[in-house]
């Protein structure tokens, strides 16, 4: 008998998702309108290209990056798309309600879509830690909670610490990583006997994961520069991110070979380590004054990523139940922290140069900001994890973890597994 989506979930998912979509449509109907004031059509196209880059990163990059499981590749890609589509809608509304609602309706601009795509990207980073262990109904909950938590975090940081769009969005790496790890910690961990093969990677899915990594690698400069307000800052961000990811690729491949007794290169190490530099320079990409610094940062990030990929999976698998190939969570947590530390170092250098305590106070504020991001990520992640454990979601049985057949119709399969 072929695997079927549990009957209760068949009732639950369409009802839950379509009700939510109907609610979103109503909210858009009553509370939003387009920015009809654009004068320059060329400017529109240029502005849209940034948003397009972000969408490619999210849909293709992160979608395929998480698709390396032997029997869960189709779900990884499609569930990512589902979460992105839902997350962007909710993020646009939430950002509008939090930032401009008192003045009347929420005005939708290309910039708000850009912000929303970046917010939704947070979910796609986090979900790497739980993909294969949850169904779509649970992922809907995760999208709603995480986008809401990130939106509120950004608003609080913006108001209390007075950071601009770029700085408060760059907490996304640390936030998404810790959110995902804390959700994973709440979910049932041990894989039952006989299913160990399902969370292993396979050649074709690994190739598509590499494709995802390549798309992310190509578009990471767009991500890091998307929210900067002046051309000089954007230019610096693009250059520094490019240098950093270029060096992290070289480091990832050579470091992976170095880490293997026979000098072989691990696909899993390379998938994540090629992105290391982009994550590490994120916060300070527009501030790094020269290419060699960005390159050194890319080198350090690549080494940390490969080192993490070698030594952390064992711990993560035992404690959090995260499979060896899902290394984005701890990778981003380490590299996001590195990026934040680099920014704090730049603040400290300013303190030394200025010779007054004012910027020292700024260092404390930045540490407070980072701490707040981590605390909110952990708390909202734990809340999400607890919600996902509720019986109403009809989570897949542990024996059916990492299995496309639980969710998808495969006409060529006459029988189950």
């Amino acid at each position: 008998m072929s695997s079927k989506y549990p009957r209760s979930v068949r009732r639950c998912l369409p009802l839950w998702a379509l009700t939510l979509e109907a609610a979103l449509i109503l909210l858009f109907y009553f509370f939003t309108h387009y920015d009809a004031s654009l004068e320059d059509q060329k400017g529109l196209v240029a502005s849209y290209q940034v948003g397009q880059d972000l969408t490619v990163m999210a849909a293709i990059g992160l979608g395929f990056l998480t698709s390396s499981f032997r029997r869960h590749s189709w779900s990884s890609v499609a569930f990512n798309l589902f979460m992105l589509a839902l997350g962007v809608q909710w993020a646009i509304l939430l950002d509008g309600f939090l930032s401009q609602f008192p003045s009347g309706k929420v005005v939708i601009t290309l910039f708000s879509i850009r912000l929303a795509t970046m917010s939704a990207l947070s979910v796609l980073i986090s979900v790497d830690a739980v993909l294969g262990k949850v169904n779509l109904a649970q992922l809907v909950v995760m999208v709603l909670v995480e986008v809401t938590a990130l939106g509120n975090l950004r608003m609080v940081i913006s108001n209390i610490f007075n950071t601009d769009y770029h700085m408060n969005m760059m907490h996304i790496y640390v936030f998404a990583a810790y959110f995902g790890l804390s959700v994973a910690w709440c979910l049932p961990k041990p894989l039952p006997e006989g299913t160990e093969d399902k969370d292993q990677t396979a050649t074709i899915p690994s190739l598509s994961a590499m494709l995802g990594a390549l798309f992310l690698w190509m578009f990471w400069p767009s991500f890091n520069s998307a929210l900067l307000r002046s051309p000089i800052e954007r230019k610096n961000a693009v250059f520094n991110t490019y240098y950093a990811v270029a060096v992290s690729v070289v480091t990832a491949i050579s470091g992976s070979s170095l880490a293997h007794p026979q000098g072989k290169i691990s696909k899993t190490y390379v998938h994540s380590a090629v992105l290391a530099g982009g994550v590490a320079v994120g916060t300070s990409c527009h501030l790094i004054p020269s290419p060699w610094l960005a390159m050194v940062l890319g080198l350090v990030a690549g080494l940390i990523s490969v080192g993490g990929a070698k030594y952390l999976p064992g711990c993560c698998n035992r404690v959090l139940g995260i499979p060896h190939s899902s290394i984005m969570g701890y990778n981003f947590s380490l590299l996001g922290l590195l990026g934040e530390i680099i920014y704090i170092v730049l603040l400290v250098l300013d303190t030394v140069g200025a010779g007054n305590g004012m910027i020292g106070f700024q260092v404390l504020l930045s540490i407070g900001e980072l701490s707040l991001a981590i605390v909110i990520a952990l708390m909202s992640g734990l809340l999400t994890g607890l919600l996902l454990n509720l019986k109403i979601w009809k989570a897949p049985h542990e024996a059916k973890y990492f299995d496309d057949q639980v969710f998808w119709k495969f006409p060529h399969l006459a029988v189950g597994f």
């Epitope: 654009l38 004068e39 320059d40 400017g43 529109l44 240029a46 502005s47 940034v50 601009t109 290309l110 910039f111 850009r114 007075n162 601009d164 769009y165 307000r229 002046s230 051309p231 000089i232 800052e233 300070s284 527009h286 501030l287 004054p289 920014y343 730049l346 603040l347 250098l349 300013d350 140069g353 200025a354 004012m358 910027i359 106070f361 700024q362």
Partner: antibody, heavy 126, light 106 residues
Framework: QVKLLESGGGVVQPGKSLRLSCAAS????????MHWVRQAPGKGLEWVAF????????YYADSVKGRFTITRDNSKNTLYLQMNSLRAEDTAVYYC???????????????????WGKGTTVTISS | VMTQSPSSLSASVGDRVTITCRAS??????LNWYQQKPGKAPKLLIY???SLQGGVPSRFSGSGSGTDFTLTISSLQPEDFATYYC??????????FGQGTKVEIK
């Protein structure tokens, strides 16, 4: 020569609309954020609105939010301010100003308005 | 909120003039100073608290960081009689100006 020239001011009744323009020349217009700043008769300067260099993001003072719209056409090197539901308190000289950024130390940028237009007068009177 | 003091002052040519600007909370060194003559547009004098804008005479100088800032004119010239405004660029998007200080001939 770097220059900003405002136009479109005039006398209008409360509740009516007006559209101000600011023509830029002598510099790369699409590389700078642009501001509108106003000055009521005998009063100080009040910032009104700001638009990013690529037009993708806009900010407004609370006093004009929902009524004024800042836009730009980089192909025409022109900045606009669409003013709707005008009130008596909107009477002022309106200046457009270019924003320039400079790097400060290692960890930040400072932004300032380094080029200003001559201003255009808007009078709201019944 | 940016508070300038004094709101007006009278001085003679050659005098050393000091205008202060206080922010309600720290703005680091994100403070700019402008000069405005009657019927004219404002003109940038100092940016980032202490950097002199190109073409501005060296008798103008700025100092301060955090919440307290000062504009100093070391030797007042006839063309310096005008109104001076401070403006913070730290708390975007609210680019607030001080209420202005009018420098008059004694």
């Amino acid at each position: 020569q770097v220059k900003l020239l405002e136009s479109g001011g005039g006398v209008v009744q409360p509740g009516k609309s007006l559209r101000l323009s600011c023509a830029a020349s002598g510099f790369s217009f699409n590389s700078h954020g642009m501001h509108w700043v106003r000055q009521a008769p005998g009063k100080g300067l009040e910032w009104v609105a700001f638009i990013w260099f690529d037009g993708s993001n806009k900010y407004y003072a609370d006093s004009v939010k929902g009524r004024f719209t800042i836009t730009r056409d980089n192909s025409k090197n022109t900045l606009y301010l669409q003013m709707n539901s005008l009130r008596a308190e909107d009477t002022a000289v309106y200046y457009c100003a270019r924003e320039t950024s400079v790097r400060l130390g290692y960890s930040r940028y400072n932004y300032y308005m380094d080029v200003w237009g001559k201003g255009t007068t808007v009078t709201i009177s019944s | 909120v940016m508070t300038q003091s004094p709101s007006s002052l009278s001085a003679s040519v050659g005098d050393r003039v000091t205008i202060t600007c206080r922010a309600s909370q720290s703005i680091r060194s994100h403070l700019n100073w402008y000069q405005q003559k009657p019927g004219k547009a404002p003109k940038l004098l100092i940016y980032a608290a202490s950097s002199l804008q190109g073409g501005v005479p060296s008798r103008f100088s700025g100092s301060g960081s955090g919440t307290d800032f000062t504009l100093t004119i070391s030797s007042l010239q006839p063309e310096d009689f005008a109104t001076y405004y401070c403006q913070q660029s730290y708390r975007a998007p609210q680019w607030t100006f001080g209420q202005g200080t009018k420098v008059e001939i004694k």
